[in-house]
């Protein structure tokens, strides 16, 4: 893996220490020839969780085009999911207009949908 990236199975991962909105985080990953992390299994979930710690971190899952989609085209419907109880809820109560369209790790690792403009940390993934 490149310097400052961590290897696991067939992928390399980079863990940010600053925050960006989801679209900017994905753009950052793309500039590194990567994408926001696509969580494909419970093992991968635990690996990322271990490195991220109890911090909100963007993952490569969004419903900004309507259906939930992983950024690399991995099928959402048949794939691994780790939503927190009651999530996703497309909450409108933030009062900023619209619901919530981007997924992130929460403090306990469970996923939540949130406003894509929140400046959360993020995780990039690329193939080895």
């Amino acid at each position: 893996c490149p310097v400052n990236w961590v290897g696991y199975e067939g992928s390399c991962y980079w863990f940010s220490r600053s925050g960006k909105p989801w679209p900017e985080a994905e753009k950052y990953c793309q500039l590194e020839n990567a994408h926001l992390v696509v969580v494909g299994s419970w093992e991968e979930q635990k690996f990322i969780q271990h490195h991220v710690g109890p911090v909100n971190s963007w993952i490569g899952l969004t419903d900004q085009s309507g259906p939930w989609k992983w950024v690399d085209g991995t099928d959402y419907e048949s794939g691994f999911k780790n939503w927190r109880p009651e999530q996703p809820d497309d909450w409108y109560g933030h009062g900023l207009g619209g619901g919530e369209d981007c997924a992130h790790f929460t403090e306990d690792g469970g996923w939540n949908d949130d406003i894509c403009q929140r400046p959360y940390r993020w995780v990039c993934e690329t193939q080895r």
Partner: antibody, heavy 117, light 107 residues
Amino acid sequence: EVQLVESGGGLVKPGGSLRLSCAASGFTFSSYSMNWVRQAPGKGLEWVSSISGSSSYIYYADSVKGRFTISRDNAKNSLYLQMNSLRAEDTAVYFCARGGSRGFDPWGQGTLVTVSS
Amino acid sequence: DIQMTQSPSSLSASVGDRVTITCRASQSITSYLNWYQQKPGKAPKLLIYTASSLQSGVPSRFSGSGSGTDFTLTISSLQPEDFATYYCQQSHSFPFTFGPGTKVDIK
């Protein structure tokens, strides 16, 4: 294939009740907000109600508040609309539709509710 | 509640014409504006979401623009299958509201 199929429409007298159902297939039902939209004969579209994926958040149009109840059973991939105290002005085709702030897609074919004595 | 208005309420056009429909919100809805097409006896079909994003499978002759309170749906070259009624809808906040519709028929 993502699909929604409504059922339960029919003729009912004013003051009566009816329960509409919407069977969903082809997607992870619990991950999506669902909606009911109606269309009176020859009229435009009117949003009726929405429910979030886990039923945490529920919203109604003022015209049906207190009379209609939206619910869902994620284990059965089903959405419901319990309609009580029906009025003539509730006569419409009722559509269920998936989605939220990014628009409603797909829609069911609709089920006709007629309120008449 | 946010009120939605559309103009014109109906229009007559020919195949190949450029058609523009406008939608106005009573207050800012940023970009949370969706467009639907409906044909008689059928369910509505999503064409454009969040003001300008083309729904998957929708022909590129359909486009949307605008933000805040004023929005436009444009059909660059009207095709026979485009004769229908078009509705705008705000999804900025509840209660969601639809415009009254614009019927596009054959001149």
